[in-house]
């Protein structure tokens, strides 16, 4: 079965800067990736970025740079200040829509013990089926 992994990293240089990396472990063709924070997309989460393999990338603050790393993984840099700034226990979710598998989503956050500059290992953490 397909899996989605999520890795969250706080940058040592800027404590309000986070990098989220997500990947899809499956054989299908990815048609869309949606990154949200504060919970899963469509379930109270706020959309930060949408990445389509051919149609382009859209992002909204505090997202600063979303990009494809490979054909099955993406990264997103967040920078915030004040109300729009992510904090250490913020949950980030990545939802991959793929054919023929359907939609798969996983969420992750910084581990409580993380030092700046360290990251959580990529986790296929709670995988939610959302066909």
């Amino acid at each position: 079965t397909p899996e989605v992994w999520v890795q969250v990293r706080m940058e040592a240089t800027e404590l309000s800067s986070f990098t989220i990396r997500c990947g899809f472990l499956g054989s299908g063709s990815i048609s869309l990736v949606t990154v949200s924070w504060g919970g899963p997309n469509g379930a109270g989460g706020t959309t930060l970025a949408v990445l389509h393999p051919e149609r382009g990338i859209r992002q909204w603050a505090p997202a600063r740079q979303a990009r494809w790393e490979t054909q099955s993984s993406i990264s997103l840099i967040l920078e915030g200040s004040g109300a729009s700034s992510p904090c250490a226990n913020t949950t980030f979710c990545c939802k991959f829509a793929s054919f023929p598998e359907g939609s798969w989503e996983a969420c992750g956050s910084l581990p409580p013990s993380s030092d700046p500059g360290l990251s959580a290992p990529p986790t296929p953490a709670p995988i939610l089926r959302a066909d």
Epitope: G42, T46, T47, L48, V50, H52, P53, E54, R55, G56, I57, R58, W60, A61, P62, R67, W68, E69, T70, Q71, I74, S84
Partner: antibody, heavy 114, light 113 residues
Framework: QVQLQQPGAELVKAGASVKMSCKAS????????ITWVKQRPGQGLEWIGD????????NYNEKFKNKATLTVDTSSSTAYMQLSSLTSEDSAVYYC???????WGQGTTLTVSS | DIVMTQSPSSLSVSAGEKVTMSCKSS????????????LAWYQQKPGQPPKLLIY???TRESGVPDRFTGSGSGTDFTLTISSVQAEDLAVYYC?????????FGAGTKLELR
């Protein structure tokens, strides 16, 4: 079917503001972003900005940052664009479009009178 | 901002002719991570909103006739109409879908000779 409904025309005096609407139907409003595009008579297309319902941080073309304000009302599935301190340069057709530009409104023709 | 330059600004054609128009971007529209070009082409007829024809530089939008073909990579792109029909007379715009702001070219107007 997917529809983006825009008022056909707005006539506003120079120096005033206008708030134009784009009412979406036929799809889940909170699942797609709305982009606004300007077209002056006989001219090309200018990208103004986009907004995702539920995210209060629109993207703006720097050129329109002090001119346009994008908002949404999820309860009525309507996107709004307010244009301030209007001049004759703002007279144009303004389109709203969904997501990756697959559906467009018919456009609102803004005429700024002196 | 990425500047999109289209040429020619207008083209006079006869029905059945093959036509090509060019679009050049001031920066590469190639996404290195997945090797996709983020460029779109639109068709606009008088009094109508633009219609998406091509995305990803070469993928036809659903319902677009196969006489429309997009090609190119990096900074140089082309839209080809293999056999122009009367209903194809319109203005064609290319758009940078790579980075904000999503700038458009000035357009190529297709006219009947």
């Amino acid at each position: 079917q997917v529809q983006l409904q825009q008022p056909g025309a707005e006539l506003v005096k120079a120096g005033a503001s206008v708030k134009m609407s784009c009412k979406a139907s036929g799809y889940t409003f909170t699942s797609y972003w709305i982009t606004w595009v300007k077209q002056r008579p006989g001219q090309g297309l200018e990208w103004i900005g986009d907004i995702y319902p539920g995210n209060d941080s629109p993207n703006y073309n720097e050129k329109f940052k002090n001119k346009a304000t994008l908002t949404v009302d999820t309860s009525s599935s309507t996107a709004y664009m307010q244009l301030s301190s209007l001049t004759s340069e703002d007279s144009a057709v303004y389109y709203c479009t969904r997501g990756y530009y697959d559906y467009w409104g018919q456009g609102t023709t803004l005429t700024v009178s002196s | 901002d990425i500047v999109m330059t289209q040429s020619p600004s207008s083209l006079s054609v006869s029905a059945g002719e093959k036509v090509t128009m060019s679009c050049k971007s001031s920066q590469s529209l190639l996404n290195s991570g997945n090797q996709k070009n983020y460029l779109a082409w639109y068709q606009q007829k008088p009094g109508q909103p633009p219609k998406l024809l091509i995305y990803g530089a070469s993928t036809r939008e659903s319902g677009v006739p196969d006489r429309f073909t997009g090609s190119g990579s990096g900074t140089d792109f082309t839209l080809t109409i293999s056999s122009v029909q009367a209903e194809d007379l319109a203005v064609y715009y290319c758009q940078n879908d790579h980075s904000y702001p999503h700038t458009f070219g000035a357009g190529t107007k297709l006219e009947l000779r």
